[in-house]
């Protein structure tokens, strides 16, 4: 009796791993096994597949097999008993192409209020991926154990900490790897799951700001208690994408180490151009808290965003302001060539009640005063760009009183 | 000004202990690896391993592990290569170089060590 | 660890014409943890490139570094007299950092 060829022979590739799967196409004819050839492009003669000869059941694994993964590939299967079927050909295909990311591992650490995930890709040192490997990101789905409601974070690297987490609460997540260069969406690790640990009793530092007074860096933040001592490290923004560099370490700013204020002060030549992570931890002298959040610090705009200066002309009813060019040292205007918006705020000398207006232009009506009447007004610009997202502080408060009434003219 | 300064020449006989030194000022020394790099005569430049002061890290690269001792006291700001049985073979220029993102910035002169019977 | 190759080994030329330099890896590599040096007798070496392709200060634009993944490429376009020296490659994407053999570049 002719034997007849395999059919519906379907290749799976997850990373490194090369599978085949195929349907036998006689179920009533025992002791038949299968072997398979390979050709590449450009080659006339067929070459045993390793690893997938004299096969007894209807799959095999040819990851040994060491293929360019960027080169079209040909298989064909017969089956094997006394004689042989007929070959049956495989559609061609690249492997780079057909493959999928595996789960990528996952390793977490808790703190009280926050979660920090090591993702790393699944299989190491692929040959799949070599050329890849940096380009990954990844993406992940959290829950509370308890609640099951999920939130979706995507868009990030190898190292990521997730804030605003309750204490003593098991959260549970899972996380997968997409190559976007090449339009490819990995599957979900294992899910993984890890309680954060009992509150601590030092809080971290928040809402830290970066701003620019002469030639330093002024950096600021909030903190709930007096009397300790604060530190701060900055990494280089990039090294995120490569936590397992050795270069990762985060460093010292040496004039921003055990400060007593919730402020300090460091010239900006210890920056050279580029962007930057920084983060604030406390120390009461026997606890320290957790590391704040991490903000991110871009030394070209840093610099540039400086508070707007500008002139008021006073009338009965309004003022007029007319918002010039920053000045750094030495009175010279500083070029700003990214978009900017203007934020006003005034208010009457005696009161604390703040208005607010937010305008593109660099002349601005303030409306609706009272004659002769103090009011002191400041400003801050802010970069239009989302991405950028940053802001100047607050110029100083400049206070002038309205005129008569009827001089609206 | 960034500087690697280190020590002397030095002639020794195998078997013999040695630990020459790289003193760095400038800049903030525990923030930068420093580097150790071998130079046999007439060859090309081989990376033994590199320390972090801030954190006292080590990585040595293969060949060289088990081979050197590498560690570093940021108290005076100094990394040091030492070995604890010289060969004749461990005869080369040895440079320290301060490490970071732009690769090694800095180098040391190099000392020069010559182990000979 | 990570195999550096550079080619050619010696590349003989005349002050004013253009050098290239090769530098392949064994593996992928970072091209933001890839540098060139220069090395003359009897001194230390010195950075021109790091991340690939940036100039280290005081470097003059004549040199230029590209490249990724397992190939990259140091060019001096119009050579000068100082520019004959050994060049090396480096990768320090791995902590086991490693250098290329060296390509002597010498006068024609």
């Known amino acids: 009796k002719n034997l007849k060829s395999p059919q519906k022979v379907e290749v799976d590739i997850i990373d490194d791993n090369f599978i085949l799967r195929w349907n036998r196409s006689d179920e009533s004819v025992g002791n038949v096994t299968f072997s398979f050839d390979y050709q590449k492009t450009g080659m006339d003669n067929w070459i045993k597949l390793s690893g997938c000869q004299n096969i007894t059941s209807t799959k095999c694994n040819f990851s040994s097999l060491k293929l360019n993964v960027y080169e079209e590939i040909k298989l064909r299967i017969r089956a094997e008993k006394e004689n042989t079927s007929s070959w049956y050909e495989v559609d061609s295909f690249t492997p780079f192409r057909k493959a999928q990311i595996g789960p990528p591992e996952v390793h977490l650490e808790a703190e009280d209020k926050a979660i920090v995930i090591h993702i790393s890709p699944g299989t190491k040192d692929s040959v799949m991926w070599a050329l890849d490997g940096l380009s990954f990101t990844y993406s992940l789905v959290i829950w509370k154990n308890s609640s099951g409601v999920e939130e979706r974070i995507e868009n990030i690297y190898s190292r990521h900490k997730i804030y605003k987490l309750s204490p003593e609460t098991t959260y549970c997540l899972k996380v997968k790897a997409a190559l976007l260069t090449s339009w490819k969406i990995g599957v979900y690790s294992p899910v993984h799951c890890i309680k954060t640990t009992v509150e601590n009793e030092l809080p971290p530092p928040e809402n830290i700001e970066v701003s620019v007074q002469n030639q330093n860096y002024v950096l600021k933040w909030d903190y709930t208690y007096a009397n300790m001592t604060f530190q701060v490290q900055w990494l280089h923004a990039f090294l995120k994408r490569n936590p397992g560099n050795h270069l990762y370490k985060w460093k010292q700013i040496p004039d921003c180490e055990n400060v007593k204020t919730t402020q300090c002060v460091f010239p900006q030549n210890v920056f050279q151009k580029g962007i930057y992570l920084l983060r604030v931890q406390a120390s009461d002298g026997n606890n320290t808290s957790f590391w704040s959040e991490e903000i991110k610090f871009d030394t070209e705009i840093q610099a540039f965003l400086l508070p707007p200066v500008f002139n008021i002309r006073s009338l009965s009813d309004s003022f007029h302001i007319y918002i010039g060019a920053p000045k750094q040292s030495g009175n010279t205007p500083v070029i700003q060539d990214y978009p900017l918006i203007y934020e006003i705020i005034f208010w009457e000398n005696t009161s604390n009640a703040e208005r607010k207006i937010i305008e593109k232009k660099t002349d601005v009506t303030v409306p609706n005063l009272k004659p002769l009447t103090v009011y002191c007004v400041k400003a801050r610009a802010h970069t239009m760009d989302e991405k950028l997202n940053k802001s100047s502080v607050f110029s100083d408060a400049v206070c002038e009183k309205t005129k008569p009434g009827n001089t609206s003219k | 000004e960034v500087q690697l300064v280190q020590s002397g020449a030095e002639v020794k006989k195998p078997g013999e202990s040695l630990k020459i030194s790289c003193k760095g000022s400038?800049?903030?020394?525990?923030?930068?690896?420093i580097a150790w790099v071998r130079q046999m005569p007439g060859k090309g430049l081989e990376s033994m391993g590199i320390i972090y002061p801030g954190d006292s890290d080590i990585r040595y690269s293969p060949s060289f592990q088990g081979q050197v001792t590498i560690s570093a006291d940021k108290s005076i700001t100094t990394a040091y290569l030492q070995w604890s049985s010289l060969k004749a073979s461990d005869t080369a220029m040895y440079y320290c170089?301060?490490?970071?993102?732009?690769?090694?910035?800095?180098w040391g002169r190099g000392t020069l060590v010559t182990v000979s019977s | 660890e990570i195999v550096l190759t550079q080619s050619p080994g010696t590349l003989s030329l005349s002050p004013g014409e253009r050098a290239t330099l090769s530098c392949r890896a064994s593996?992928?590599?970072?091209?933001?943890?890839f540098a060139w040096y220069q090395q003359k007798p009897g001194q230390a070496p010195r950075l021109l490139i790091y991340g690939a392709s940036s100039r280290a200060t005081g470097i003059p634009d004549r040199l230029s570094g590209s490249g990724s993944g397992t190939d990259f490429t140091l060019t001096i376009t119009r050579l000068e007299p100082e520019d004959f020296a050994v060049y090396y490659c480096?990768?320090?994407?791995?902590?086991?950092?490693?250098f290329g053999q060296g390509t002597r570049l010498e006068i024609k």
């Open positions: 593996q992928s590599v970072s091209s933001s943890f």
């Open positions: 170089a301060r490490h970071d993102i732009e690769g090694f910035d800095y």
């Open positions: 400038g800049y903030i020394f525990t923030n930068y690896w």
């Open positions: 480096q990768q320090y994407d791995s902590s086991a950092i490693t």
